[in-house]
Structure formats: C-alpha cells, structure tokens
Amino acid sequence: QAAPFPELCSYTWEAVDTKNNVLYKINICGSVDIVQCGPSSAVCMHDLKTRTYHSVGDSVLRSATRSLLEFNTTVSCDQQGTNHRVQSSIAFLCGKTLGTPEFVTATFCVHYFEWRTTAACKKDIFKANKEVPCYVFDEELRKHDLNPLIKLSGAYLVDDSDPDTSLFINVCRDIDTLRDPGSQLRACPPGTAACLVRGHQAFDVGQPRDGLKVVRKDRLVLSYVREEAGKLDFCDGHSPAVTITFVCPSERREGTIPKLTAKSNCRYEIEWITEYACHRDYLESKTCSLSGEQQDVSIDLTPLAQSGGSSYISDGKEYLFYLNVCGETEIQFCNKKQAAVCQVKKSDTSQVKAAGRYHNQTLRYSDGDLTLIYFGGDECSSGFQRMSVINFECNKTAGNDGKGTPVFTGEVDCTYFFTWDTEYACVHHHHHH
C-alpha cells in the first residue's frame, strides 16, 4: 500500500500529552525505530511518569483515507469484555505548512491526533519544494514552534555589514519568489532557503534538510546545506552551509532582525532573537487573556465580547464580515455555524461562510505583535478551512468606549486579515521570565 502522505514520510514526528506527561513518536510511513516499542511500531508512546514504552500503532496494521490514518495493534485494551484493540487515529486537515501532529485525547483504547498540513490539501498551492519539521519539544516537553515564522512567499533579510551582498532566508522551507515581480529576490534559484545575492547574481547557499533541533532550553537550531554538487567559485572549495540559531529572549521585547554573526568560506552563522523560539505556552492562550507568571504580561481582550446578539461589522468591499470575538454568542447571519467571524456576500446574502469558529481560538503575543486567530471555518476549494487573523494595536483613545472596531485589510488564500485598534490591546508587562 502506497504511503498516503509522502511529504511527511521522511521524518519521525513528535506529539505530547502534557496532562499525562506522555511523549508520542510518530512515523506514518515506516517504523519509529525505538527498540522498546518493537520493530514495526508507527506510533510509540513513552510514558515519562512510569518510564515505560508502549506501541499504540503498528505500521503493518495501517488503514488510510484522504483525511484519516489509523494504526491498529494486536494489543487488547481489555474494555469490559469487548475485543477492542489499542489503536491510534490521526485526522488530517489542510494547512499552509507541513505543520505538527497535535495530541487531542486518549480513551482507554484509542489515541487521537489532529494534523493540519499541506499534505492533506486538495490542491498543491501551499506545497513547498522543500520543507522540514519546524517545531521541537524541550526536555520539559514544552513545545517550541517556529511554524508562524514560515513565509509562504517572500523572505527575511539577514542583517549583514557587507554592502555588496544580501542574504535572504526563509524558515524551514524554501523561498517562494513567484509573487514578486521585480526585486533582487526573483533571481534566487528554486529550492533555496538561503539565497545570497551579489549584484545581479543570486546563489543557493542552503536548502533545508533536517528538522529544527533544540540545543538548550531557549536555543533552537536550523541547518541548511547546498544539496547539489559543484562548488561556488567564491567559496574556496567549501560547500556552502547556513546555521540559524533562534534565541528566546530573557524578557519580553519587540522582534529583532536575524543577524549574521559569522561568515567564513560560505559558512554562514545567523542568530535570531525572537520570542517564537520560546515555548508555546509563553506566547499563546486558548482563551482571550494572557496573564500570570508564565507569560510575563497581562492582556485581557474579553471586554471586546459583544452581548445580546450584536456583532462588530467590517466592510470587505464584496463581503461584509460579522465578528464576535472572545465569546460563544452565535452571529445571527451565521446561525448554527459557531462562527466567531462570519463572511456574507453583499450581492447575495444567502452566501454565508464561517471564517473561523469561536471554539478554535488562539491568542498570541510574540515579538510585540498581539494577534487573535480563529481557524476551522468553512472549507475553500483547496480544502483549507477558512481562518481569520486579527492584528491588535494599542490605542488608548479608541472610539466605541475604548473598544474600537475591526478593519478588514485583505485576504490571501482563504485567510482573512483584520486590524483592530483598541485600548484593550495595551499590554502590561511584568519582568520575571
């Protein structure tokens, strides 16, 4: 049986059940290569409390549909006289990066995971030439996830003192320049994730090969190498390589630019101080507030919730967007869709789409940007579920009793962007990270 998601096959992936202190290793096309789980385990569970290993999915006993992968085992789960077997179930949804498998829950018999990934899309519009896993768990099983830094188009410029060259990078995947008509970036060779531009020439100095690694709790490393043979004439016979070290800052701060810290014989070392390198619980919340010792800040957007069936309205030229954030109030136009953001076509108000649901909510504060994300909306033709990204700005003089109002700024591939100036986005900092 052919592998259902070939782009996910090259790696062993990790997921964590934080509540029970369990680490899962997942290899969807082969086995995870952990002796304690046996030679054919596709999903290996490591219980760190009891220091035991169990195979909860066998690569030989795999069944697949376009959106669901199940790994059975021969192990009985002894559930009141039934002959059920322990199994793992991975639900796949379309995403814009390779993404990460997320542990959902475990019953007595079944271990459930969800994975938003380009591999599950109906169209190839989000697929990279080359992409590697972009997250890692530290020794305390805390997740560090650089997926939000991945650019689907364009690149980051590395701060370098050399006026004659420009070094462009992407994170965990190659640079897509197709949407850029006229800049230097357009000359970058396909597949490169680190592109060096000198004058009118562009050179591939690194492609992603291995996934993100953790070297210390707050330092993550990504390595790019130039795959193809044939040395560049300015590299003194060496093969180019790029090492990017992502550093979680010791306290809250604005984002910084990736900086070139060393360069020798086409070996480039880059340091990037960014809060995205910190563990995810430091940056994100599933509620509308971020506060406490863990996050070093106090943010509470719950006063923006609308009561009594009213919504914020944002004009999007062809569409009207109805928003009801930080609550579970149904938007009247989007009845029974559980939408936090509802898109209604002006010319035909029967055309209504959920552009993100209120129970699929993430509040993120990272590198000085405060963002509320609603995902899991109605599907687009690519298979991607509509989502909304609301970028908040602090404005102490915002109208509407300080609440302000969301402004639609654009749409890209079924992701809807808004900005919202409000006094409730004014962040209060603590200093004890």
Epitope: K151, G154, D159, D369, V412
Partner: nanobody, 123 residues
Framework: DVQLVESGGGLVQPGGSLRLSCAAS????????WGWFRQAPGKEREFVAA????????SYADSVKGRFTISRDNAKNTIYLQMNSLRPEDTAVYYC????????????????WGQGTLVTVSS
C-alpha cells in the same frame, strides 16, 4: 501584482508640511513591507521610511527621523508619508514601493514601484 499610485507632491516653503499618499491595488496582502524612497536629481534613490502592513512597526532614515511619519489606512489600502519641517535638501521625486522581504530598507529588494511624485522645497 501590486499597482501603486502616489499623490500629494508639490511646491512648499522651507519649514512647511506636505502629506503624500500611495494607493495600492492588486493582491496587496502578499507584500509585507511598504516603503517610501526618494531620488534627488543626479543622486541615487534613497530610503526614507517603511511600515509593515500587518502591524504598525516602522523604520526611518536618520535624516528624516522626528520630521516624517509613515502610516497606513488598511481600509483604503493606502500608505501615507506626513512630512513636517521640510528642508531644501528634501527636494526629490518620492516613490512608494512594496516588498515581500521583511526587515529591508534596500530599494533593490522592493519589487513594485509607483511612478513617483515631485516634492520641491524652496522659498
């Protein structure tokens, strides 16, 4: 692709003010960085100011810091450059540009350009 149209240039006395506008159309959200550049006669094109579309993060050339302010109106897909305390050396053609490169002020990293609007500071 992105189309950019500047307006608001003109003749102004030293110490005066002008507000330049740049209207963007096309798939504007695929660009992350919006910049104003200027080119005086016989000189290279130089960076003036930049802003990111998704947030209010800005950067300025040292020569205009404290005098010029870049801003944007997302609802109108428009970028502005408010120029105060103008000096004769600010005389130039001002260009609006868009880039898919983050953290750049280099004009060669900007792939989409407007046609420019002339600002003349003279008494």
């Amino acid at each position: 692709d992105v189309q950019l149209v500047e307006s608001g240039g003109g003749l102004v006395q030293p110490g005066g003010s002008l507000r330049l506008s740049c209207a963007a159309s096309g798939r504007t959200f695929n660009t992350y960085n919006w910049g104003w550049f200027r080119q005086a006669p016989g000189k290279e094109r130089e960076f003036v100011a930049a802003i990111r579309w998704s947030s209010s993060k800005t950067s300025y050339a040292d020569s205009v810091k404290g005098r010029f302010t870049i801003s944007r109106d997302n609802a109108k897909n428009t970028i502005y450059l408010q120029m105060n305390s103008l000096r004769p050396e600010d005389t130039a053609v001002y260009y609006c540009a868009a880039s898919i490169v983050d953290f750049t002020t280099n004009p060669s990293h900007f792939g989409s350009w407007g046609q420019g609007t002339l600002v003349t500071v003279s008494s």
